[in-house]
């Protein structure tokens, strides 16, 4: 007996699609070996139609796929646009030849069933409206009109022209005539449900002179669209329910036996399991909307349905669209930390993976906000200016070729806690979600800058020092000047590096930066940080104010600017710390639910790089231009 298992008999009708699942024993060899689907010929030869090696026969071109699910030990053959010629004997199997392990499948494709000549077939989706057309002769123009539904031999009246309506069709069925038409009446049945399907008879008049028409109503549950996504990637459900529900609340739900549990709706409901990784985006005024879910998990696989109803909940007889989501565990997207922890006043360095084949793509970092349908305004990007409230404390470091970029956020406050998304304008699957948890600091920060009141005088020499603990001894220390398009590394001098590597004096580990001579444009935020290769670690920030020699009062109160890193709430950030004429990025968050477009994030801020020569051991640490 074959260890491969599948459906022995598959029957369908012309024009339909079938999905044939074949199960195989769970072994490493089976998971990785070739999977195939072949058609058995009279001569005993089985001709391959499609295989997991990428082969696709001419007769299956554009209408078939074979997808392996190694984690479930199954593979699925999807065949669309069936014709009667597809009827025959097939094998689904494993192995390098079509003689290995296989299972016999019989496929029968029949014609769409025919009804009596006078039967009109109406095919409608659940929740839609059908208009049944009933013709009659002039002699019955003033006679009673009715529509009944066949149940066995009986025909139960649904609606008639005396204003009778069957209770199960109440508020759903209307009988009417159009304009001056004297030979036709219509019955509308709205909010169709599966039990509405069947044979209807419409009648004008009574007895032998009555005019009768047969109507076969087929009510279709939406055939789920199959979506195959990788673990940790993202999926977008594009929902188009039609104009008639444009003004009703929209929802996406996940089928769970008898119910469909709402994941998100436009009335503000959201399943906690999708917190931080879901966005619902209205597309237009015709009721189109999309739902984006990032950071896909194995348990996200299943049947999903979108719909519309004033309650924001699934309701029988309202239009729906359906999907079946498969989550493939053999993912190309690397596993990255989903929770990053920081402390107030400290910093975090978040590594964002992206498709290494798309190193030139634009990188972004956005803050997921829970309000209503969820949104994700961009905070920083490779060509997006840093958003207000994040000046001096947020930067994106691209590391071309590494398949990752790093986002650093410092001067943390508890208000920074929340969900953030890494995304690019390239491969939309590579969207990752990070939850940032900021706790109150219980000890001094690892990096400390002196002097804390940093005011430099134009034309003079100004040095700031960054004290670091011995645990950072072997790491690379750096100073950088923050600007709206990143933090540009400056020459600096590591005092601690002169010591022997055996001992480490906790009090004398210093990396310093000197501005010589100080210029007006040196004013701004400076960061001291540590890193190992391209792996960024802790940072701390300080605002350096620059004043004229002659002036008695400084341009800015540096204590206020730097207090933010210690204990001031985010809202109290200095207003004048960045030029007000800079272009602020203002990306519409809805663009990020769209797989196709991410708009240019605005003019790039003018670069403000400091450069110079690293100083000698004597302490001359370089200058900024």
């Amino acid at each position: 007996q074959s260890p491969i298992f599948g459906p022995q008999d598959v029957s369908s009708i012309e024009g339909n699609s079938v999905s044939i699942t074949c199960y195989y024993p769970d072994t490493s060899v089976n998971r990785h070996t070739r999977k195939y689907w072949c058609r058995q010929g009279a001569n005993g030869y089985c001709a391959t139609l499609i295989s997991s090696n990428g082969y696709l026969s001419k007769e299956y071109s554009g209408r078939a796929s074979l997808i392996n699910f190694p984690e479930n030990s199954t593979f699925v053959i999807n065949i669309a646009h069936l014709t009667q010629e597809d009827t025959g004997s097939y094998k689904c199997g494993l192995g390098t030849t079509n003689r290995g392990l296989f299972f016999d499948v019989s496929l029968e494709v029949s014609q769409v069933p025919e009804f009596p000549n006078d039967t009109h077939v109406y095919t409608k989706d659940i929740g839609r409206t059908v208009t049944i057309e009933c013709r009659f002769k002039e002699g019955n123009a003033h006679s009673k009109k009715s529509l009944c539904k066949k149940r066995g031999e009986a025909c139960e009246v649904v609606i008639d022209s005396t204003e009778y309506v069957d209770p199960s069709y109440k508020d759903r069925a209307i009988l009417f005539m159009k304009g001056t038409s004297r030979d036709i009446f219509y019955v509308n049945i709205s909010h169709l449900i599966p039990s509405d399907a069947g044979l209807y008879v419409c009648q004008a008049g009574e007895g032998p002179s009555a005019d009768k028409n047969n109507a076969d109503l087929q009510v279709l549950e939406p055939e789920p669209e199959l979506l195959y996504k990788d673990l940790r990637s993202s999926v977008t459900f594009e929902c188009d329910l039609g104009r008639e529900v444009a003004n009703d609340a929209k929802y996406l739900c996940r089928k769970n036996k008898e119910t469909c549990d709402v994941i998100i709706n436009t009335l503000g409901k959201r399943d906690p399991a999708f917190e931080g990784r879901i966005l619902l985006t209205p597309r237009d005024d015709n009721g189109r909307f999309s739902v984006l879910i990032t950071g896909l998990r194995k348990e996200d696989a299943g049947h999903y349905q979108c719909g519309a109803h004033s309650s924001g909940l699934p309701q029988e007889g309202w239009p729906v669209q359906a999907w079946q989501l498969f989550v493939n565990e053999e993912s190309t997207i690397p596993n990255s930390r989903s929770v990053v922890k920081g402390v107030t006043g400290g910093s975090v360095a978040i590594v964002c993976p992206y498709n290494p084949k798309e190193s030139s793509s634009l990188k972004y970092w956005c803050h997921w906000e829970a309000d209503e349908n969820g949104r994700c305004p961009v905070l920083v990007g490779t060509q997006a200016l840093v958003q207000e409230g994040y000046e001096g404390r947020l930067a994106l470091f691209d590391q071309p070729g590494s398949g990752a970029y790093t986002v650093i956020l410092n001067q943390l406050t508890t208000q920074d806690s929340g969900f953030y998304w890494c995304l690019t304008d390239g491969d939309s699957r590579w969207r990752t979600t990070i939850e940032l948890q900021v706790a109150e600091a219980t000890k001094k920060p690892d990096l400390e800058v002196t002097p804390q009141n940093a005011t430099a005088v134009i034309g003079e020499t100004f040095t700031i020092s960054c004290h670091y603990p011995c645990k950072f001894y072997s790491q690379e220390k750096y100073w950088c000047k923050w600007s709206n398009d990143g933090c540009h590394i400056l020459p600096s001098h590591d005092e601690g590096a002169r010591q022997s590597s055996v001992s480490c004096d906790q009090s004398s580990q210093i990396v310093s930066m000197t501005l010589n001579p100080v210029k007006k444009e040196d004013e701004g935020w400076y960061w001291c940080g540590v890193k190992e290769g391209q792996v960024y670690g802790e940072t701390t920030a300080i605002y350096v104010a620059v004043e004229e020699r002659t002036r008695g009062s400084p341009h800015i109160n540096p204590t206020d600017a730097n207090a933010r890193a210690k204990d001031a709430p985010e809202e109290e950030a200095m207003e004048s710390s960045v030029r007000e004429d800079e272009n602020k990025a203002n990306l519409d968050p809805r663009l990020f639910a769209d797989e196709r477009e991410i708009q240019n994030a605005g003019d790039q801020a003018q670069e403000n790089r400091a450069s110079g020569n690293a100083g000698s051991a004597g302490g001359q640490s370089g200058s900024s231009k």
Partner: nanobody, 129 residues
Framework: EVQLVESGGGLVQAGGSLRLSCAAS????????MGWFRQAPGKEREFVAA??????????YYAESVKGRFAISRDNAKTTAYLQMGSLNPEDTALYYC????????????????????WGQGTLVTVSS
């Protein structure tokens, strides 16, 4: 809530035939799955056959041990499944359970009880030699 009621079981001689029925009430599925499992005394519940339907498609699955002898079908009203059993032998003696569900995930193994949400009480089939 869906109720499943099996009928058609009984005592039959080896080589004989029986037709089991499983009537579902409470809800109709426009797409779904109905299956038959059996449990002989002192043994584990085992898969016999299943029928899955969706959008005009029907898929029939059989256990290797009943292939060619048993046939599963359902009526068009989508409420009853049948198991036509032929060439019965004493090893077929068991309590036969009907199980049903809405269409499960495409890659859940239908031979396991897990995908089936609704179960009947069972009908006894005894095959004497």
């Amino acid at each position: 809530e869906v109720q499943l009621v099996e009928s058609g079981g009984g005592l039959v001689q080896a080589g004989g035939s029986l037709r089991l029925s499983c009537a579902a009430s409470g809800r109709t599925f426009s797409s779904g799955i109905m299956g038959w499992f059996r449990q002989a005394p002192g043994k584990e519940r085992e898969f016999v056959a299943a029928i899955e339907w969706s959008g005009g498609n029907t898929y029939k699955y059989y256990a290797e041990s009943v292939k060619g002898r048993f046939a599963i079908s359902r009526d068009n009203a989508k409420t009853t499944a049948y198991l036509q059993m032929g060439s019965l032998n004493p090893e077929d003696t068991a309590l036969y359970y009907c199980a049903a569900d809405e269409s499960p995930s495409r890659y859940i193994d239908l031979r396991r009880p897990a995908p089936y949400h609704y179960w009947g009480q069972g009908t006894l089939v005894t095959v004497s030699s």
